[in-house]
Structures are given as structure tokens and as C-alpha cells.
């Protein structure tokens, strides 16, 4: 069964910077990745980035840069402007559309005990949805 993992990481050098890493474990090729916060895409979540392997990438504030790390994983850099966007308590969701598997989504957040600069372990897929 395909699986999606999500890691949320606070940068050691800049405590206001966070990075969300997401990956797809499974066969098939990725056709689209959507990253949202506050819940799954289309279910109360707010879109932060969309990445397409050929058509490009797009991010929305407070996301700074969305990029492919491998053909099946992405990273999204975020700038926390303070109290208005408390990333430390936020859920981030990544939805991977792949052919021929369909769509798979998982969510994760920064562990409460996270030290700056330490990456959270792969989230044990609290939300996994196949469309």
C-alpha cells in the first residue's frame, strides 16, 4: 500500500523558520503534490504550495519556497511571522496524486519536544486518505 510521510522541522539558526518535508512511498509516478496547513486540502486546510513535475511550483505566504528533493519527495520552507502563525502548533498535510494509485494524503506537526534543528521522525501517518 502506498504511504505518505511528513516531517516538520524547526531550523536551528532561525527559530522563525520551519521546513516541511513530505514523501511518497510506493510505485507509480507523482503527478501533483499539494501542501496545506490546518487540515487536509479541501477539508478545512489552507493551501500553502502546489508542485507539478513539469508545469512548475507555486507557493503562498507564509511559504517561501517549494522544491522537489527527489522524484517522490518535496520540501517547503516557511517563515513564521510570529504570533499570527504559530507553526509549532500547526498541522501540515501533504497530498500526493500519483498514477495509477490515485491520491494519498498524510498530516503531521512539529513534535512538542522538538529541539531546534532536529528533524521530527517520519510521522506515523495520522491521516491517510486514498481518493
Amino acid at each position: 500500500t502506498p504511504e505518505v510521510w511528513v516531517q516538520v522541522q524547526m531550523e536551528a539558526t532561525e527559530l522563525s523558520s520551519f521546513t516541511v518535508h513530505c514523501g511518497f512511498l510506493g510505485p507509480g509516478s507523482i503527478s501533483l503534490v499539494t501542501v496545506s496547513w490546518g487540515g487536509p486540502d479541501g477539508a478545512g486546510g489552507t493551501k500553502l504550495a502546489v508542485l507539478h513535475p513539469e508545469l512548475g511550483t507555486r507557493q503562498w505566504a507564509p511559504a517561501r519556497q517549494a522544491r522537489w528533493e527527489t522524484q517522490s519527495s518535496i520540501s517547503l520552507a516557511l517563515e513564521d511571522s510570529g504570533a499570527s502563525s504559530p507553526f509549532a502548533n500547526t498541522t501540515f498535510c501533504c497530498k500526493f496524486a500519483s498514477f495509477p494509485e490515485g491520491s494519498w494524503e498524510s498530516c503531521g506537526s512539529l513534535p512538542p519536544s522538538s529541539d531546534p534543528g532536529l528533524s521530527a521522525p517520519p510521522t506515523p501517518v495520522p491521516i491517510l486518505r486514498a481518493d
Epitope: 502546489v50 507539478h52 508545469l55 503562498w60
Partner: antibody, heavy 119, light 107 residues
Framework: EVQLQQSGPELVKPGASVKISCKAS????????MSWVKQSHGKSLEWIGD????????SYNQKFKGKATLTVDKSSSTAYMELRSLTSEDSAVYYC????????????WGQGTSVTVSS | DIQMTQSPASLSASVGETVTITCRAS??????LAWYQQKQGKSPQLLVY???TLTEDVPSRFSGSGSGTQFSLKINSLQPEDFGSYYC?????????FGGGTKLELK
């Protein structure tokens, strides 16, 4: 056939505002973001920003924040751009352009609206 | 913001010739580079995206290449309808930025 029909040329005085329109047809209006692009005479293209027709959310090029305001009227499939506090630097042709997912390529373009700022 | 630098700014060529236009990005944009063609008095039209994918109805005499920060658009055997201006644009996040343009004129 996809069409983006823009409003006609504008001659406006310095300090005034202008609102130009872009009526979309031939596709589902909410499937494409609407970008606006400036082309000064004989010059290159500058992305002003775009608007999500589903909810009116906007993204702006920092350079045009405070200068341009982008809106949509879903019921008439029309996008609008208002330019304020106009100066001669704002004299240009302005294009609307529709962008499909992930909203970074301009797939369809309007014919352009010429704005001339002169006293 | 990502700066896009195009060269040459203008180019004169004859029908049947082959020309190459180059575009440089100020940072790595992977393969996310598009080209637009604009004919005199008309709107720009998307020609190429993802460095080398031609949009529908674009003739095969057009070809794109490059990656990272260096890209080029090559037009083989120029036809009369190819003359006009060409602009590169990255599609790697916002703000979207364009190159300064290359005006391709008939010699």
C-alpha cells in the same frame, strides 16, 4: 474556444485611478487563476499579481502592492484590476492572462488594454 | 526574486536561417523555464514550458534546452511567421519574472 475580452483603452490624468476589466469565456472561470501583466512601451513583461476566482484571494508582486488591486466577479466571469495614484510610469499595455494549475504558466491571454497617463 | 537575463536583446536573421536565444536565471530553477512569443501588436503566446515541452500547434523547428540556470531556445529554418519578440519566464514559484526579451527581426 477560450477568450479573454479586455475593456478598451484609457486616457487618464495623473493622480487618478482606473479600473480595467477582463471577461472570460469558453472555460470554467474558477479553474484558472487570473494573472495581470504590465508591458511598458517597447519593454518587457512584468507580472503584477494574480487572483483566485474561487475565493478572491490575491497574490501580488511586491513592486505593485499599493498600486494595483485585483478582484473578480464570479457571477459574470470577469476579473478586474484597479490602478491608483497614476503617474506617467504607469502608462503601459496591461494584459490579463489565465493560468491553470499550478498557476505559474500563462496559458491564455487577453488582447491587452492600453492605459495612457497624461495631463 | 529570481532575475531572468536574456540575450541578445535583438537579432537580425533571414528566412531559412537558424537562430538561438539564451536565458540565464539568477538561481537554480531546475527545468522550470518557459518561452513566450509575441508578434507586433499582439498578445504574448506560450510556446514552450519545462525547458523543452512545446505547446500544442508549435512547430518542431522550435526546440528548448538547458537546466539549472542556463537555457536556450533554438529556431531552425526560420519562417516568416517566426519574427517578433521572445521572452523567457521561470515557473518556479512567485513572483513570476520574465527576461528582458529578444526582438527577432528580418534581415
Amino acid at each position: 474556444e477560450v477568450q479573454l475580452q479586455q475593456s478598451g483603452p484609457e486616457l487618464v490624468k495623473p493622480g487618478a485611478s482606473v479600473k480595467i476589466s477582463c471577461k472570460a469565456s469558453g472555460y470554467t472561470f474558477t479553474d484558472y487563476y487570473m494573472s495581470w501583466v504590465k508591458q511598458s512601451h517597447g519593454k518587457s513583461l512584468e507580472w503584477i499579481g494574480d487572483v483566485n476566482p474561487n475565493n478572491g484571494d490575491t497574490s501580488y508582486n511586491q513592486k505593485f502592492k499599493g498600486k494595483a488591486t485585483l478582484t473578480v466577479d464570479k457571477s459574470s466571469s470577469t476579473a478586474y484590476m484597479e490602478l491608483r495614484s497614476l503617474t506617467s510610469e504607469d502608462s503601459a499595455v496591461y494584459y490579463c492572462a489565465a493560468s491553470g494549475l499550478p498557476y505559474v504558466l500563462m496559458d491564455y491571454w487577453g488582447q491587452g488594454t492600453s492605459v495612457t497617463v497624461s495631463s | 526574486d529570481i532575475q531572468m537575463t536574456q540575450s541578445p536583446a535583438s537579432l537580425s536573421a533571414s528566412v531559412g536561417e537558424t537562430v538561438t536565444i539564451t536565458c540565464r536565471a539568477s538561481e537554480n530553477i531546475n527545468s522550470y523555464l518557459a518561452w513566450y512569443q509575441q508578434k507586433q501588436g499582439k498578445s504574448p503566446q506560450l510556446l514552450v514550458y519545462n525547458t523543452k515541452t512545446l505547446t500544442e500547434d508549435v512547430p518542431s523547428r522550435f526546440s528548448g534546452s538547458g537546466s539549472g540556470t542556463q537555457f536556450s531556445l533554438k529556431i531552425n529554418s526560420l519562417q516568416p511567421e517566426d519574427f517578433g519578440s521572445y521572452y523567457c519566464q521561470h515557473h518556479y514559484g512567485t513572483p513570476l519574472t520574465f527576461g528582458g526579451g529578444t526582438k527577432l527581426e528580418l534581415k
